[in-house]
């Protein structure tokens, strides 16, 4: 029961996490610049991984996509790649984990197969979460670096002077969504891996022992078979006593009239 709960909870947490990673990847507010000192109008500039937007105090808002790949910073490309890899791995992990859920019966799937699938999805969730956390952290680092570099970056161009505007580069909402979502996916993955341990069937050694009585009594099997836990003296399936008791491996091929097993 605890295993099913752990697996189910891991799945739900990962599902929320991956939904968050997708949301963060699509969001426009990865970084924001509040151009409060603009002489014309208050301008609020914000960027995502795919487009940049501007909002003015008048309410005017315009977004433009980055239609080129070549002119973009390598860091931004790396963040895009990390987030997409995270989403793809997470989606595959979700697909695998649906079939691995203990509460869902698919044909005659064995517990060992479900355990393997649970472990696979768990690892996928962990990697997915790490990709998202890495992606968001790389972007945050880029913003911090940009802030320090923009404090005194001025140069003269062909058409006069070009300088970097003094702005407050702040972390956008998408960064926090990404960090939380990545963390949830990671936690969900760990929970799936823990659930896998409970799902995996222990290697049992249920070898029936038939007792051949010397008289006309019926042969029987004792009910309490020993699993290979290492406890008890008969872990190697040795003969218990020589008075006709044999393990299944040692039973003669010809049938006996008292052999009902």
């Amino acid at each position: 029961m605890a295993v099913t709960a752990c697996q189910g909870l891991g799945f739900v947490v990962s599902l929320i996490g991956i939904a968050g990673i997708i949301a963060a990847t699509c969001m426009d507010q990865w970084s924001t610049q509040d151009l409060y000192n603009n002489p014309v109008t208050a301008v609020f500039n914000y960027q995502g991984l795919w487009r940049s937007c501007v909002r003015e105090s008048s309410g005017f808002t315009e977004c433009r996509g980055y239609f080129t790949l070549l002119g973009l910073p390598a860091m931004l490309q790396a963040v895009r790649a990390l987030m997409i890899v995270g989403i793809v791995l997470g989606a595959i992990g979700l697909l695998v984990s649906i079939f691995a859920l203990k509460c869902i019966r698919i044909g005659s799937m064995e517990d060992s197969a479900k355990a393997n699938m649970t472990l696979t999805s768990g690892i996928m969730f962990i990697v997915s979460g790490l990709c998202a956390i890495a992606g968001v952290s790389v972007f945050a680092n880029m913003l911090v670096t940009n802030f320090w570099m923009s404090t005194a970056n001025m140069y003269t161009g062909m058409g006069g002077m070009v300088q970097t505007v003094q702005t407050r580069y702040t972390f956008g909402a998408a960064l926090f969504v990404g960090w939380v979502a990545g963390g949830l996916t990671l936690i969900g993955g760990v929970m799936m891996c823990i659930a896998c341990r409970g799902l995996a069937p222990e290697e049992t050694n249920y070898k029936a022992v038939s007792y051949h009585a010397s008289g006309h009594s019926v042969a029987y099997k004792p009910g309490g078979f020993k699993a290979s836990t290492g406890f008890g003296s008969n872990t190697k399936n040795k003969k218990i006593y020589d008075g006709g008791a044999r393990t299944e491996d040692e039973v003669q091929s010809y049938p006996s009239k008292h052999d009902y097993v």
């Epitope: 014309v40 940049s52 005017f60 002119g71 880029m142």
Partner: nanobody, 121 residues
Amino acid sequence: EVQVQESGGGLVQPGGSLRLSCAASGNIFRIDTMGWYRQAPGKQRELVAGISRGGTTTYAHSVKERFTISRDNAKNTMYLQMNSLKSEDTAGYYCNAQAWDPGTFRYLEVWGQGTLVTVSA
């Protein structure tokens, strides 16, 4: 790299009119605000008029009712229509553009080299 180039300056009589143009060129992603600044000899540079991408305008108190700023977002061009010019309007007029640059992931401010407007009889 983004560049801005002013044009339209010259000598004009008091009460006359001039139309200044500022064209932005280069690797432009999006220019948000554009403005005209002027600097008379021995004085500080001051904002004459500015216009946002959304069309919000601002004017210096001394030029209100006389100057009109406009822009064409598609052409990345800004205009300043100057009417009823006075001798105190004599100055170097500079174009300013604030643009977002995805290449550096930074906000850039670009200044032109200026165009001279002389109001004299």
